[in-house]
């Protein structure tokens, strides 16, 4: 759709005559009829296929025609067309004399024609005014013409419709060729797609207006490039939503079970060496002079009964000192001044001479010990029971009474109540001081997770458009992770599909 514009500029008819050569009375009151039609190889009479237009009387004999366009007048003359501009045309301009006020063709005598021109033209849309002049023996007509597109029509032949808009159906202005030019922040065929915040993750983020970055379920951060870990995840991270990948030293569904108690709590005291021996479990290896589960107890050096032959031990600042009974001497009262003749062996011990009678040794019966068999054997003196176990003498032997959670001859083995997998339905087992505790997955409860309480929230396939369903184990609900191009709690709404013809 467009307009052929014809600007009449000057008409010269100095003698004031008609085409027949007869003069006009009193002068030639001149008006024009214009016929625009399709290009003809030979211009020939026929219908004005592109339109016609007539002017009022513009002057007498010779005159210049005023440009009236600014005042809403009729010069340039407008010949609108509602088709693709073909680029070529035939143009016929007739100058007529109006003896009276009636300018209708049927009201004029046939010999009222002053002059007639007929040309074949070629004209591109939007070209500058093309000036032409047609001269005959009696008249001269100067005129110019051009073709422009109607509002909202563009292109080489005014065939492209484009209406600028800034609404739900598009955000654009029109280029001279009719192509869309998106407003800042918009893209796509119809400029309906907002350009999200720079760096906004292509899959995990989206936007409804420019420079925005809205995260899809399971993602967070300014650019939606950080996954949201499982609800309740304590010491863990994720690489996809709702994961809980435990940090080093942590375990369990929520990464809240301490697998590295030694590092996280440093329980061993007095420079002892700590060894992890299971979940929330450890063993301290004490430095000399210390004892207790956490090596928190300082040992008296006399506790190891270093003094022999009935010597009595006295603690000192820097160690201990043995007070020897008569007949003995040495750091530990280990040297005797007695011989077998003195019957030094008690409790039925038998005496043997040594070093040609200068010394002796007692061979003690069972349950007795010491240089002179003077001590009843106490098998608990060396604290053989680990992990706080209590040592009990039982005649010739001894036994360890272990604290709860420990077993073995010397209470050296940690008993895990969880070892027999007591938690049903994938429950996670936690060892406690006095027993165990089960953490149940969604859908199960009870002391051993034996009671079914709900079903998998994703079992009913609630997500549309091939979205991924995640069950939120802490709330028994589902979350849909939408593929690109869909939004909504169930990914049921498509994002920004272009309409077929928005106008």
């Amino acid at each position: 759709s467009g307009v052929f514009q014809l600007q009449l500029q000057e008409f010269i008819n100095e003698r004031g005559v008609l085409a027949s050569g007869r003069p006009c009375e009193p002068g030639c009151r001149t008006f024009f009829r214009v016929c625009l039609k399709h290009f003809q190889a030979v211009v020939s009479p026929g219908p004005c296929t592109f339109g016609t237009v007539s002017t009022p009387v513009l002057g007498t004999n010779s005159f210049a025609v005023r440009d009236d366009s600014s005042g809403g007048g009729r010069n340039p003359l407008q010949l609108p067309f509602n088709f693709t501009w073909p680029g070529t045309f035939s143009l016929i301009i007739e100058a007529w004399h109006a003896p009276g006020d009636d300018l209708r063709p049927e009201a004029l005598p046939p010999d009222a024609l002053i002059s007639k021109i007929a040309i074949q033209g070629s004209l591109a849309v939007g070209q500058n005014w093309l000036l032409d002049e047609q001269t005959s023996t009696l008249t001269r007509l100067r005129y110019s013409y051009r073709v422009i597109c109607s509002d909202n029509y563009y292109g080489d032949n005014c065939s492209r419709l484009c209406k600028k808009r800034n609404d739900h159906f598009g955000h654009y202005v029109c280029q001279p060729d009719g192509n869309l030019s998106c407003l800042p922040g918009w893209t796509g065929e119809y400029c309906q797609q907002p350009i999200c915040l720079s760096g906004c993750h292509e899959q995990n983020g989206y936007c409804s207006k420019p420079a925005e970055c809205l995260c899809r379920p399971g993602w967070q951060g300014r650019l939606c490039n950080e996954c949201i870990p499982h609800n309740g995840c304590r010491h863990g991270t994720c690489s996809t939503p709702w994961q809980c990948t435990c940090d080093e030293g942590w375990g369990g569904l929520f990464c809240d079970q301490d697998l590295n108690y030694c590092t996280h709590h440093s329980p061993c005291k007095n420079g002892a060496t700590c060894s992890n021996s299971g979940q929330r479990s450890y063993t301290c290896t004490c430095r000399p002079g210390y004892t207790g589960v956490d090596c928190e107890l300082e040992l008296s050096e006399c506790d190891s009964n270093p003094c022999r032959n009935g010597g009595s031990c006295k603690d000192q600042e820097d160690g201990y000192h043995c007070l020897c009974p008569p007949g003995y001497y040495g750091l530990h009262c280990e040297h005797s001044t007695l011989s077998c003749a003195d019957s030094p062996c008690f409790n039925g011990g038998s005496c043997r001479e040594r070093n040609q009678g200068a010394n002796y040794a007692c061979e003690c019966p069972p349950n007795f010990t010491g240089s002179n068999c003077e001590k009843k054997v106490d098998r608990c003196t060396s604290n053989p029971c680990a992990n706080g176990g209590q040592c009990l003498n039982r005649g010739p032997s001894r036994m360890c009474r272990c604290r709860p959670g420990f077993t073995g001859t010397y209470c050296e083995l940690h008993v895990s109540d969880c070892a027999r997998n007591p938690c049903a339905h994938g429950g996670t087992c936690h060892d406690l001081e006095n027993g165990l505790m089960c953490t149940c997955p969604a859908g199960f409860s009870g002391r051993r997770c034996e009671v079914r309480t709900s079903i998998d929230a994703c079992a009913s396939s609630p997500c549309f458009n091939r979205a991924t369903c995640y069950t939120d184990l802490s709330t028994d609900t589902f979350v849909c992770n939408c593929p690109y191009g869909f939004v909504g709690s169930r990914c049921e709404f498509p994002v920004g599909l272009p309409p077929s013809f928005p106008w």
């Epitope: 003809q40 190889a41 030979v42 020939s44 009479p45 007929a118 040309i119 074949q120 033209g121 070629s122």
Partner: antibody
């Protein structure tokens, strides 16, 4: 009196060139589209080329496209036809004509003979 | 291209006869057709243009009719000077195309 007078014809070898002229008088030459039309000996009429009144539009028949060029000089009221790479089948009487049936105009020249032969 | 088929290609008639020549276009040319008369060694002379309009100075015994694709030239009463070759020409689209011609001879 309206006159169109062609000149420039003659005998030329195949592959040769000729330039035909058509001098107009007795009418306003610059107002009209002009045509070259030829007639081979004993044959019918055949249109060759067209140029619009201002020279902005030209058309040619397929068999002469790229070889013939039509032009005009309105200040001299003269029409031209530059013929290159001539062939035997171009042998004919060449007429220039001013045709505008809307205005009842139909002016023809008497023609100039072009013979292409070795 | 638009083909113009003219018939007959030749015709013998006597002075005073009514003669009809037809021309058929291969596509619609509206009324953009002319009829020419040519005598040996002369330039063609326009008789009828726009299918049915008589050119100034042409005797009224010549008339044209038709539109679209079928056209007719009629000579109502043949005169001795009318014996010549007649051509139709379509002026609707380039390339301009003529009919093959009809040679009108004295019987």
């Amino acid at each position: 009196e309206v006159q169109l007078v062609e000149s420039g014809g003659g005998l030329v070898q195949p592959g040769g060139s000729l330039r035909l002229s058509c001098a107009a008088s007795g009418f306003t030459f610059s107002n009209y589209g002009m045509y070259w039309i030829r007639q081979a000996p004993g044959k019918g009429l055949e249109w060759v080329a067209f140029i619009s009144h201002g020279g902005g539009i030209t058309y040619y028949r397929d068999s002469v496209k790229g070889r013939f060029t039509i032009s005009r000089d309105n200040s001299k009221s003269t029409l031209y036809l530059q013929m290159n790479s001539l062939r035997a089948e171009d042998t004919a009487v060449y007429h220039c004509a001013a045709l505008n049936w809307e205005l009842g105009i139909d002016y023809w020249g008497q023609g100039t003979m072009v013979t292409v032969s070795s | 291209d638009i083909q113009m088929t003219q018939s007959p290609s030749s015709l013998s008639a006597s002075v005073g006869d009514r003669v009809t020549i037809t021309c058929r276009a291969s596509e619609d040319i509206y009324s953009n057709l002319a009829w020419y008369q040519q005598k040996p060694g002369k330039a063609p002379k326009l008789l009828i243009y726009a299918a049915n309009r008589l050119q100034d100075g042409v005797p009224s015994r010549f008339s044209g009719s038709g539109s679209g694709t079928d056209f007719t030239l009629t000579i109502s009463s043949l005169q001795p000077e009318d014996f010549a070759t007649y051509y139709c020409l379509q002026g609707s689209k380039f390339p301009l195309t003529f009919g093959q011609g009809t040679k009108l001879e004295i019987k």
